[in-house]
């Protein structure tokens, strides 16, 4: 058992290519650091994997489409939504997420968990931010980027607790 | 409606320095990013560098390592620190300031000749 780290996240929300600036952003403390995370602050734009089966990023070959700086090939700074569960373990997921040039990654429970979290041990995946969201919360920004919306998150670090019991998968 | 007015551009030898600097006006928040393009003659406009909100530096992989963005949100100004410059930087520089996000059409300025001699 170890302490665990809360995450402090704002998320924004919105439509692109529209000439609208107007974004939403909600804050909340709903979030919680993997063991093996840097605890660090990140930020970036939310992206799942391609694919509707793919959401458990558990294919080595899982792709994300990430934007670009407008005019260029450049991708603005990302983080990989990916869905606790579907047979892989948390280290890979953020190892494939790190692989694919994400920010950080932030895994949302698994269906019927609510807005539960728990801490996730994922060791020799320590290269990027890794937290944790409730399924609430996960599955609607994915509902979101699905519709088209644009969903950036500021992750920032926020107050320990514990000791937790570590969890691998 | 933003205006965006840059300077700093000129004639420099290869392996020289200039610093390129764009203020912008009107309603323009810290929370937008701002950017360098360039062009040059007969070809197309092309991405140099950007900044993000939260100060987050995007370059193409030709400046990398030679070019460094920043910005002073208080003065809603960006700077382009351009080092080790070479003939094939020779181009029209133009400031951007994206309408919404990184991944959106910008608002540009009129852009300041950078000439680089070898």
């Known amino acids: 058992a170890e302490a665990v780290w809360t995450a402090y996240l704002n998320v924004s929300w919105r439509v692109p290519h529209t000439g609208v600036n107007r974004t939403v952003w909600e804050l909340s403390e709903e979030g919680v650091y993997g063991q093996d995370s840097p605890l660090e602050p990140v930020a970036g734009v939310l992206v799942p994997p391609d694919g509707p089966g793919a959401l458990n990023a558990c294919n080595p070959h899982t792709n994300f489409t990430v934007p670009t700086v407008w005019g260029s090939t450049v991708q603005v700074s990302w983080l990989a939504l990916i869905q606790r569960g579907g047979g892989c373990t948390f280290a890979d997921k953020i190892h494939l997420a790190y692989e694919r040039g994400a920010s950080g990654a932030v895994i949302f429970n698994f269906p019927g968990t609510r807005n539960e979290v728990i801490p996730m041990s994922h060791p020799g995946a320590v290269d990027i931010v890794a937290i944790m969201i409730g399924n609430l919360k996960g599955t609607k920004i994915l509902q979101s980027i699905q519709r088209g919306i644009q969903v950036t998150m500021v992750i920032e670090v926020g107050k320990k607790h514990g000791p937790w019991v570590n969890h691998y998968s | 409606q933003v205006q965006l007015q840059e300077s700093g551009g000129g004639l420099v030898q290869a392996g020289g320095s200039l610093r390129l600097s764009c203020a912008a006006s009107?309603?323009?928040?810290?929370?937008?990013?701002m950017g360098w393009y360039r062009q040059a003659p007969g070809k197309e406009r092309e991405f140099v560098a950007a900044?993000?909100?939260?100060?987050?530096?995007y370059y193409a992989d030709s400046v990398k390592g030679r070019f460094t963005i920043s910005r002073d949100n208080a003065k809603n100004t960006v700077y382009l620190q351009m080092n080790s410059l070479k003939p094939e930087d020779t181009a029209v520089y133009y400031c951007a300031v994206y309408t919404t996000a990184l991944d959106e059409y910008p608002y540009w300025g009129q852009g300041t000749q950078v000439t680089v001699s070898s």
């Open positions: 900044i993000g909100s939260g100060a987050i530096t």
């Open positions: 009107g309603s323009i928040s810290g929370g937008k990013g």
